[in-house]
Amino acid sequence: LEVQVPEDPVVALVGTDATLCCSFSPEPGFSLAQLNLIWQLTDTKQLVHSFAEGQDQGSAYANRTALFPDLLAQGNASLRLQRVRVADEGSFTCFVSIRDFGSAAVSLQVAAPYSKPSMTLEPNKDLRPGDTVTITCSSYQGYPEAEVFWQDGQGVPLTGNVTTSQMANEQGLFDVHSILRVVLGANGTYSCLVRNPVLQQDAHSSVTITPQRSPTGAVEVQVPEDPVVALVGTDATLRCSFSPEPGFSLAQLNLIWQLTDTKQLVHSFTEGRDQGSAYANRTALFPDLLAQGNASLRLQRVRVADEGSFTCFVSIRDFGSAAVSLQVAAPYSKPSMTLEPNKDLRPGDTVTITCSSYRGYPEAEVFWQDGQGVPLTGNVTTSQMANEQGLFDVHSVLRVVLGANGTYSCLVRNPVLQQDAHGSVTITGQPMTFPPEA
């Protein structure tokens, strides 16, 4: 019995659902009562899901798997794995037994995009040409391990004096910290690029240093110029720092975080004490770092509704403030493609191709093109609907008249993450049914 699975690994984003495709060719008169189907982990032989004696025997894998019962009789033995985790990565074997027996293994490659890097400088004040500074580039919650590249403001690679460390959290996601030590020139731009090698996703940030003395007087409060980009459900750090003078003590510090527009209190530190979160108990300071001038705020389990500007007010003797923007994002799922009509298609027929991608934020950009890369812009209707969490489901509909044959591809881009998800469908000229019957 020939069992077919994709040659290439199935790439799935952490937290999304993945389909491990597996198919066989049922003979005429085949009934599900004859079918024994087992999915198991290739290496450990752990049972994942099974179908036997005409019945779905259910998930043996954390209740996160499902078959496609309506499609089994057509030879579709694919497995749906929900809420993918890093620990799911590996090989899954699909065993099919009717009269004969066959099996094949499909690889699941798990991935998670890295956040836009944050850049910090040490020391961060009174910088002069000739000073040695340490620039730290930090990017969070990605998988698998990142590749990190540094360059100057004219594209020259900086490879000396770079130390990169990557630490996995409980979920197996990596936080990357890359440190560059440089001797300052008159001025300079230093940029750090963090690449996810599986998603081929680049996240980059840069810092321009103009050595000069800081002005005296008001407290200089420093925040990142660029918005902080955070994935829905992850934690975000809104960076804010000030330069404590010698002899500074926390008893002198008044620190207030509030929403810039509404002035709603988010978190505060006064009278030498952390006054706690006034924002759904999802915020925290870094108490051990406050005395060093680190007034950053940790926002947990980020939601779409958190997007916006947060102001960091610091008062010691003098007073200073700065606002940092939080940009929330969520990657779009790999688009699913449907055709209407989907059978007995002939050249000259008008078909409606629907491309659907789910649970992304912010709104997507959708591009259609044919098999030669020619953009298809006529007869396209795209709708985007937000769910209760504010995440968008995208449905883009293309109406085309079939030629002799043709490939139609749909690219769904998350403009913040610069994450592209695409699907395509190839329609051949002879009468056909979609999806092709096994």
């Epitope: 360059q151 690679p157 490879t159 690029l193 690449r195």
Partner: antibody
Framework: EVQLVQSGAEVKKPGSSVKVSCKAS????????IHWVRQAPGQGLEWIGY????????DYNQKFKDRTTLTADRSTSTAYMELSSLRSEDTAVYYC??????????????WGQGTTVTVSS | DIQLTQSPSFLSASVGDRVTITCRAS?????MNWYQQKPGKSPKPWIY???NLASGVPSRFSVSVSGTEHTLTISSLQPEDFATYYC?????????FGQGTKLEIK
């Protein structure tokens, strides 16, 4: 129009030196690095090194480090490549090119027309 | 040094063919650029930052990446596409080019 115009062809004796010029126009000369690349007859492209006209920082391919000097004259927006102790295998077309783009992606967007250097006794 | 190995070195094809040229890096690169060169002419920028087409480059050109392997695809060869193509990286010194792939008319 952004242009890099190189000096004319040179015929040199083994052991001598050659100095090739590359005059930039149509953009701020100090904003981009200028690189030198050579191509021997029927062969591929080989990087020699670059100069930052603003800081005058240079870096060289180790292969050429001992024999090559890159300089830049900001007053005339001209970059120079001098190659000494010439040998027959230095016979090649020498190109200057501007490394352009924006962080973090850069590429050679403008090339000179090339200068043919022939080393022959 | 990061070596870039292009394959094939020579490729004969006909107008209308779909062709692929591969550039394999000996280690990870921050991005890859591609240049087109015709006999007696200077190289021209063709693809930059791994997959972006330079100005005036037709959309039949595309690049895909798998690990350290970058593949340049021309979906339907046109007469003006016959030339030599070079890949280039500068993630670390020295800047390196692939040895080139010469695309000839069959």
């Amino acid at each position: 129009e952004v242009q890099l115009v190189q000096s004319g062809a040179e015929v040199k004796k083994p052991g001598s030196s050659v100095k090739v010029s590359c005059k930039a126009s149509g953009y701020s000369f100090t904003s981009y690095t200028i690189h030198w690349v050579r191509q021997a007859p029927g062969q591929g492209l080989e990087w020699i090194g670059y100069i930052n006209p603003n800081s005058r920082n240079t870096d060289y391919n180790q292969k050429f480090k001992d024999r090559t000097t890159l300089t830049a004259d900001r007053s005339t927006s001209t970059a120079y490549m001098e190659l000494s102790s010439l040998r027959s295998e230095d016979t090649a077309v020498y190109y200057c090119a501007r490394y352009s783009g924006s962080t973090p992606y850069w590429y050679f967007d403008v090339w000179g027309q090339g200068t043919t250097v022939t080393v022959s006794s | 040094d990061i070596q870039l190995t292009q394959s094939p070195s020579f490729l004969s094809a006909s107008v209308g063919d779909r062709v692929t040229i591969t550039c394999r890096a000996s280690s990870s690169v921050s991005y890859m650029n591609w240049y087109q060169q015709k006999p007696g002419k200077s190289p021209k920028p063709w693809i930059y930052a791994t997959s972006n087409l330079a100005s005036g480059v037709p959309s039949r050109f595309s690049v895909s990446v798998s690990g350290t392997e970058h593949t340049l695809t021309i979906s339907s060869l046109q007469p003006e596409d016959f030339a030599t193509y070079y890949c280039q990286q500068w993630s670390s010194n020295p800047l390196t080019f692939g040895q080139g792939t010469k695309l000839e008319i069959k």
